[in-house]
Structure formats: structure tokens, C-alpha cells
Amino acid sequence: TIDTKRNISAEEGGSVILQCHFSSDTAEVTQVDWKQQDQLLAIYSVDLGWHVASVFSDRVVPGPSLGLTFQSLTMNDTGEYFCTYHTYPGGIYKGRIFLKVQESS
């Protein structure tokens, strides 16, 4: 199963950690996809390493673990984020996070 904070908030100009936790006694994670709505943010593959989409490469840093650190947030970053865990032999598991970017006080 996937466990995640469903709603998180952060300040404009700040940073936030997007994190999904996968727990299984038997399945092994082979790949994790991160998307902002339908747009690819990053891919982690056991066989390939991390790939961050070039449009986000100056603001998205892999980690901690299989999560992402999203930096220099703007109001436009508000929205849904999805993690997709590809596991063997368990199949595919998805998680959703809603990020609200608030004006800095």
C-alpha cells in the first residue's frame, strides 16, 4: 500500500518534500514515477537511477529516499501530484498529494 500526506502546504519561494511511502513484505520497488498533474516531474529506476524532467531540473532534487524536494515554489505549483510505484511482483500502486502554495507572509 501507499501511505502519504494527502494535503500539504508551503510558502511561495520556499521548498517542500513530496513523499510517498510504500510498504510491502514481499514486493520490491523497481521504479517510481512522479507527475505534476499529467506532466512528468521525475523518474526513479533501480536500473537507471534518477531522471528529472528538464523543465524542472533547476528546482527539483531527488530525495529524501524515493521522494522529491521541490524548491523555489511559485503559486503555479499549487495542484495535484502523483507518485506511481512499480513493484515486483506486487504490481503498480499510486498515491496522490495536493500541494497548496501560499503567499509568503
Epitope: 523518474i43 533501480v46 536500473d47 537507471l48 537511477g49 534518477w50 531522471h51 528529472v52 531527488p62
Partner: antibody, heavy 119, light 107 residues
């Protein structure tokens, strides 16, 4: 014996296209990520592209993105690289390569096929 | 992209010498580093993966070490067949990147 054999290289004018092939044998081709790596004459190695075992995903170096397409036919044990809008800087020896699973390193390489882009 | 800087770019050595080549990454890559040997007109040959794991069939005189940003390939006792160019490659991030190479020449 595990083997990769590239073909399809040649001399081509700038702006034209070329398709490289890589015939695989001696291993379960459809179970492996496959890579293309190139080497300009007298220069170092440059990773070009990778394709997932089932062909579902593909990733490219920025230098070839939008011009090159990696593909595979697992029924024919063959990897391809379609190269469009070729430039002089694409002149290189092109290798296909197979990784050691989960090691992120390439243990089997073909002999390479030479692509020369020149007017 | 992660830059890999190899040093020296070339080294002259004699048979029996201990040769050390370093590879520095522009940011941390954990232990995701491989080393290759390439001879003129030939494809690269994998020597080391995971910074320190010896590839099957590679002589034990080759060894690798390091993690994070600094890595080393050592040839404990150089043999005639070891004169070649050596490349490091990182695989923490795609695109995978290679160092510029180190040419090991006969003194």
C-alpha cells in the same frame, strides 16, 4: 555467447536521416534495458538514449532529444536508433550496449557503427 | 547534468608500476560509479561497477574505491595489456555521463 552487432552507419549529408540497428543474441533481449552510446573521433564517450525492456519508456540526451528515436522489436531481438535532422556534431561511432541488471553499468557492447555527417 | 572530472588526463608508467586514476563528480552520486577500459579501435570494457565491485573476468589487480564525489581506480601492478584509456561513468542521474578519459601510456 552474448553478442551485439550494430549496422546501418554511413556517410550522410546534414539534415538527412539514418537508421541504425543492433542485433542481439545470446541473452533474453526482452528482459533488458538497452542503451545507445556514441564516441566522436578522438573524443570520449557520450550516452545517447535508453529504452525500457518492453519499450514503454524512452529517455534521451538533450543533444539528440527531438531528433533521435530509440525503439526495439523484441520479437526480432533488435534495437534501433532513428536519427533525423543530422548535424556535423553527430559524427561518431555509435555503440549499442546492454547493462548488468541493477548495476547501472554496461557490460556488453557492440563493435560500433560509424556515422559521418558531412556535405 | 553531472560532470565527471578525471585526473590525470594521461600518465606514463612502466610494467609493474602502481597506477592510480581519480574521478571527481560535480555532485554526490553515492556509489553509482563504473570504470571502463578502452583500447584503440575497440569497444569499452567494463572493469568496475558500484564504485568497487569487480566485473566478472577482470583481473584482481584492478580495484575501485570511493563514494559521494571522489573515486579512484587503482591498477596494483601494471601489465603490458593494461596500456589503454580509462573512463569513469556515473549512474546516479540520467543522463549517464562519462569522464573525459585517462590515457595510460608506456614510459
Amino acid at each position: 555467447e552474448v553478442q551485439l552487432v550494430e549496422s546501418g552507419g554511413g556517410v550522410v549529408q546534414p539534415g538527412r536521416s539514418l537508421r541504425l540497428s543492433c542485433a542481439a543474441s545470446g541473452f533474453t533481449f526482452g528482459s533488458y534495458y538497452m542503451h545507445w552510446v556514441r564516441q566522436a573521433p578522438g573524443k570520449g564517450l557520450e550516452w545517447v538514449a535508453v529504452i525500457w525492456p518492453d519499450g514503454s519508456n524512452k529517455l534521451y540526451a538533450d543533444s539528440v532529444k527531438g531528433r533521435f528515436t530509440i525503439s526495439r522489436d523484441n520479437s526480432k531481438n533488435t534495437l534501433y536508433l532513428q536519427m533525423n535532422s543530422l548535424r556535423a556534431e553527430d559524427t561518431a561511432l555509435y555503440y549499442c550496449a546492454k547493462p548488468v541488471p541493477k548495476s547501472r553499468a554496461l557490460d556488453v557492447w557492440g563493435q560500433g557503427t560509424m556515422v559521418t555527417v558531412s556535405s | 547534468d553531472i560532470q565527471l572530472t578525471q585526473s590525470p588526463s594521461s600518465v606514463s608508467a612502466s610494467v609493474g608500476d602502481r597506477v592510480t586514476i581519480t574521478c571527481r563528480a560535480s555532485q554526490g552520486i553515492s556509489s553509482w560509479l563504473a570504470w571502463y577500459q578502452q583500447k584503440p579501435g575497440k569497444a569499452p570494457k567494463l572493469l568496475i561497477y558500484g564504485a568497487s565491485s569487480l566485473q566478472s573476468g577482470v583481473p584482481s589487480r584492478f580495484s575501485g574505491s570511493g563514494s559521494g564525489t571522489d573515486f579512484t581506480l587503482t591498477i596494483s601492478s601494471l601489465q603490458p595489456e593494461d596500456f589503454a584509456t580509462y573512463y569513469c561513468q556515473q549512474a546516479f542521474y540520467l543522463p549517464w555521463t562519462f569522464g573525459g578519459g585517462t590515457k595510460v601510456e608506456i614510459k
